[in-house]
């Protein structure tokens, strides 16, 4: 495939990435499919600078980011490194919380009205980000 | 990589009081929830208690609560369980398990309850 | 209280075989299911999270499904390296709860 120079049409660029912001909500796995329909994937947070550029643009709504922790450890859609990666959970999260009745505990990461991070039920709809690389290579063939 | 080391368990006589220590290592300790299991000689696995990341959230199992007190200090990547009331039936090898489906687990320590 | 019945309790299989091992739950736990391996003398490993999903590291030819209540636990061709004790546990609600195991015995 080619590789990728511009972003799509409605998408914001940003320090080599593009974003597209949702407006309406969706679980999480069908946001991070969503996504993955365009070629892209839930954003992914790696630095304070790309947290307050999301945060600007999300405004004061949950929203759904690529981090879960569906089979334990909490990981990143990307394979970017939970462990040694940027993080801005709210005090005492993520708390795993039983506590709403839906069954299981919380195990998908949202942006919340203040922009930190909470982990919720993954089934609830949010809105949600998407990221793709403009360095990455596109699916797309290439022109011939 | 992710370590889980128990330490604190012992010969004890009924009605007395141990306390158990998991030190945790490899990972962010401080954004996982921590459980304690146990597993009697010969017998299955019982889950005893869990605690969420920052301790806002505690349960046990009915046969030890108000005996047993799980605690955690993310400072220093520590777990704990205060078992008091020690009975004879207590006696088991006691493992700690990070999140509620259990995905790494410690070596375990074996605790005797007997006089 | 969620009770997970585990059958069969014990099993013996020859090495090649396709083992298969089930799980009910007392009531719907929303795929909220583990499996886990125990030897003798040592700690559990973790195979299988949601019901499905193997963790990482676990060979392919343990495979788990299922849904509601009703679970299974499915090796396809034992390995010497497989005999051992399987337990089932649910996390959709506290108490959490295991099964009582399956000891997978050589024939």
């Known amino acids: 495939g080619s590789e990728r120079t511009c972003c799509p049409v409605n998408w914001v660029e940003h320090e080599r990435s593009c974003y597209w912001f949702s407006r309406s909500g969706k679980a999480w796995a069908d946001a991070d499919n969503y996504c993955r329909l365009e070629d892209a994937h839930l954003v992914v947070v790696t630095s304070w600078e790309e947290q307050k550029f999301v945060q600007h643009h999300i405004g004061p709504v949950n929203t759904w980011m690529g981090l879960h922790d569906q089979n334990g450890p909490w990981k990143w859609v990307d394979g970017t490194d939970y462990e040694t990666g940027f993080k801005n959970w709210r005090p005492e999260q993520p708390d795993d919380w039983y506590g709403h009745g839906l069954g299981g505990g919380e195990d998908c990461a949202h942006f919340t009205d203040d922009g930190r991070w909470n982990d919720d039920v993954c089934q609830r709809p949010y809105r949600w980000v998407c990221e793709t690389e403009l360095d990455k290579a596109s699916q797309e063939p290439p022109l011939l | 990589e992710v370590q889980l080391v128990e330490s604190g368990g012992g010969l004890v006589k009924p009605g007395g009081s141990l306390r158990l220590s998991c030190a945790a290592s490899?990972?962010?300790?401080?954004?996982?929830?921590m459980n304690w299991v146990r597993q009697a000689p010969g017998k299955g696995l019982e889950w005893v208690s869990s605690?969420?990341?920052?301790?806002?959230?505690?349960y046990y199992a009915d046969s030890v609560k108000g005996r047993f007190t799980i605690s955690r200090d993310n400072a220093k990547n520590s777990l704990y369980l205060q078992m008091n009331s020690l009975r004879a039936e207590d006696t088991a090898v006691y493992y700690c398990?990070?999140?509620?489906?259990?995905?790494?687990w410690g070596q375990g320590t074996l605790v005797t309850v007997s006089s | 209280d969620i009770q997970m019945t585990q059958s069969p309790s014990s099993l013996s299989a020859s090495v090649g075989d396709r083992v298969t091992i089930t799980c009910r739950a007392s009531?719907?736990?929303?795929?909220?299911l583990a499996w886990f391996q125990q030897k003798s003398g040592k700690a559990p490993k973790s195979l299988i999270s949601?019901?499905?999903s193997l963790q990482t590291g676990v060979p392919s030819r343990f495979s788990g499904s299922g849904s509601g209540t009703d679970f299974t636990l499915t090796i396809s061709s034992l390995q010497p390296e497989d005999f051992a004790t399987y337990y089932c546990?649910?996390?959709?609600?506290?108490?959490?709860?295991f099964g009582g195991g399956t000891k997978v015995e050589i024939k």
């Open positions: 398990a990070r999140v509620n489906l259990f995905d790494y």
């Open positions: 490899g990972f962010t300790f401080s954004s996982y929830n």
């Open positions: 605690i969420s990341s920052s301790s806002s959230y505690i």
């Open positions: 009531q719907g736990i929303n795929n909220y």
């Open positions: 949601v019901a499905s």
């Open positions: 546990q649910q996390y959709n609600s506290y108490p959490l709860t």
